[in-house]
């Protein structure tokens, strides 16, 4: 899971100020038991700082340690930091710990850019605020790292959620998830609810606002309004998705399906932006860049570096198009949509200007390994991982910012013909040249 | 080779408005490539950005002067223009016009400057 | 907000010396970074933009460097007409409206 560009965004506040909540509809589809309903104890769990990760309190070893843990469905180790770091305000001290045991054996994870490297042990592990479980689960005690933690990110460890295949140093290293659903009654399923602030916070604010939630074992209705569509899961490895259509304001980019998906597309929360692949992002822009043809913006800004600055509370957000990513549904010839706003991928950056201007940086990038369904996409939803049925929901979050012309949206069904072939097939490869990091 | 020219009064009277005038030659104020701004330098100090517009019409102003700032575009008579409310001594400053290029995003092209002195 | 501080604010030189101007930014501006040129009586003139390119025209003597928060305005070798007062500006934040408060190069 790559570092800067693919940390996740940014925390919100539960109410999406700056933005409107949408009203609750009413709920369609039966109850199915210990999977569906209200999980109270797990609502709010989470919260983070723009650009920096969205993160989750556990507690790890005898008597228990607290740490904050960042939430990444783009990885599939459990690592925390277990030695001094002039970023770390705690790590994990194994030697605390009456229940760690060493595994005798190391883990070293490149980035693209830095990299971690640590012991792998196991230890018992539980989420305070979530189901009320402990487990024994592998944990990398991170021992030495570079470019990992960030400074006032105010987490520090990092919890894979995807499968043993992309697990570091190899397949044998059962992620945590896994430990859980097996060593528990806990439901082979967890949802995301990802709350953009839509305006940055500072330190303090951070410390004190909900950044969203993970519901671990179930959904909560109150996370979400409308019906929860769902995609296949690819392959049990990212969390790999299939996109049949790209849509900017309604307009197709037309391009070969593949193309979405070259050489994958994944839903990914340890990842900021939306991440296209090169042919793909630069057809978007194009295409961004004409609908919002009123006002011209730097180059450096499309290229996710320049800020523009606007008076505050003027933002154009009219001129911005919306994006419509079509995915895979379950039946045969059927697809659905989800639809973001310039309040998704327009990324509100703090400190930069003065207290009277919103700042903000292009949240789409370019990438030379697939799309990247980070969380510029995640903040419009409700996402549903569920294991258990192969496959991922997506329903519009309660907690997603817009205003009162326009909202995140999902919709379907569509009928679109020949999806399978929109998958790519990555050659097989040696393991060892898998890159971790996305560039 | 485009040439920029501010023309307007040398002297305001404190609490009028004051008004310039950037005629540009040689070029056009509807390029698709360029914003044009105004930029000003109180008598032996440093330069202070005034605000910013594009051929459209969009307009961006520096938040300490935005209250009092208009900035507005005539694409026809290829001339953009600065009005500026409630002047005090405190705004007698050289004006500068400019054109912001090399990826719109610094000054690459400027006019000479008027001096405005704002005095009853 | 972010602030480009200059320094020195005065640096007194011979012709034919080499000037080193630093520009700071209270944050990292990227590459973000202009220098301009000014000599009394006339308008600002670009001489860098993007930290290290050259504007048209500009003598191969300017040469500027730097990311981030530093950065360097270097006259290899000062002739008369160099002496003037120069200003760093940064566009990370757009539409460009920072300028630092210049430093003045003046003949010893």
């Known amino acids: 899971t790559q570092h800067g560009i693919r940390l996740p965004l940014r925390s919100g506040l539960g109410g999406a100020p700056l933005g409107l909540r949408l009203p609750r509809e009413t709920d369609e589809e039966p109850e199915e038991p210990g999977r569906r309903g209200s999980f109270v104890e797990m609502v709010d769990n989470l919260r983070g700082k723009s650009g920096q990760g969205y993160y989750v309190e556990m507690t790890v070893g005898s008597p228990p340690q607290t740490l904050n843990i960042l939430v990444d469905t783009g990885s599939s180790n459990f690592a925390v930091g277990a030695a001094p770091h002039p970023f770390l305000h705690r790590y994990y001290q194994r030697q605390l710990s009456s229940t760690y045991r060493d595994l005798r054996k190391g883990v070293y994870v490149p980035y693209t850019q830095g990299k971690w490297e640590g012991e792998l042990g196991t230890d018992l592990v539980s989420i305070p605020h979530g189901p009320n479980v402990t487990v024994r689960a592998n944990i990398a005690a991170i021992t030495e790292s570079d470019k990992f933690f960030i400074n006032g990110s105010n987490w520090e460890g990092i919890l894979g959620l995807a499968y043993a295949e992309i697990a570091r140093p190899d397949d044998s290293l059962e992620p945590f998830f896994d430990s859980l659903v097996k060593q528990t009654h806990v439901p082979n399923l967890f949802s995301l609810q990802l709350c953009g602030a839509g305006f940055p916070l500072n330190q303090s604010e951070v410390l004190a606002s909900v950044g969203g939630s993970m519901i671990i074992g179930g959904i909560d209705h109150s996370l979400y309004t409308g019906s929860l569509w769902y995609t296949p899961i690819r392959r049990e490895w990212y969390y790999e998705v299939i996109i049949v259509r790209v849509e900017i304001n309604g307009q197709d980019l037309k391009m070969d399906c593949k193309e979405y998906n070259y050489d994958k597309s994944i839903v990914d929360s340890g990842t900021t932006n939306l991440r296209l692949p090169k042919k793909v992002f630069e057809a978007a822009v194009k295409s961004i860049k004409a609908a919002s043809s009123t006002e011209k913006f730097p180059d450096g800004f499309w290229l996710g570096e320049q800020l523009v600055c606007w008076q505050a509370g003027t933002t154009p957000w009219n001129i911005f198009p919306v994006i419509s990513l079509y995915l895979m549904g379950e039946v045969t010839n059927q697809s659905f949509r989800i639809t973001i706003l310039p309040q998704q991928y327009l990324r509100p950056v703090e400190d930069v200007a003065t207290s009277q201007d919103d700042c903000y940086k292009f949240a789409i990038s370019q990438s030379s390994t697939g799309t990247v369904m980070g969380a510029v996409i995640m903040e419009g939803f409700y996402v549903v991982f569920d294991r258990a049925r192969k496959r991922i929901g997506f329903a519009v979050s309660a907690c997603h910012v817009h205003d009162e012309f326009r909202t995140a949206a999902v919709e379907g069904p569509f009928v679109t013909l020949d999806m399978e072939d929109c998958g790519y097939n990555i050659p097989q490869t040696d393991e060892s040249t898998l890159m971790t990091g996305r560039a | 080779q485009l040439q920029l020219q501010e023309s307007g009064p040398g002297l305001v009277k404190p609490s009028e408005t004051l008004s310039l005038t950037c005629t540009v030659s040689g070029g056009s104020t509807s390029s698709s490539s360029y914003y044009w701004g105004w930029i000003r330098q109180p008598p032996g100090k440093g330069l202070e950005w005034i605000g910013s517009?594009?051929?459209?019409?969009?307009?961006y102003y520096n938040p300490s002067l935005r209250s009092r700032v208009t900035i507005s575009v005539d694409t026809s008579k290829n001339q953009f223009s600065l009005k500026l409310s409630s002047v005090t001594a405190a705004d007698t400053a050289v004006y500068y016009c400019a054109r912001v290029g090399h990826g719109i995003s610094y000054f690459d092209l400027w006019g000479r400057g008027t001096l405005v002195t704002v005095s009853s | 907000e972010i602030v480009l501080t200059q320094s020195p604010a005065t640096l007194s030189l011979s012709p034919g010396e080499r000037a080193t101007l630093s520009c700071r930014a209270s944050q990292s501006v990227s590459s973000y970074l202009a220098w301009y040129q000014q000599k009394p009586g006339q308008a600002p003139r670009l001489l860098i933009y993007d930290a290290s390119n050259r504007a048209t025209g500009i003598p191969a003597r300017f040469s500027g460097s730097g990311s981030g928060t530093d950065f360097t305005l270097t006259i290899s070798s000062l002739e008369p007409e160099d002496f003037a007062v120069y200003y760093c500006q940064q566009s990370l934040t757009w539409p460009p409206r920072t300028f630092g408060g210049g430093t003045k190069v003046e003949i010893k």
């Open positions: 517009i594009y051929r459209s019409g969009s307009t």
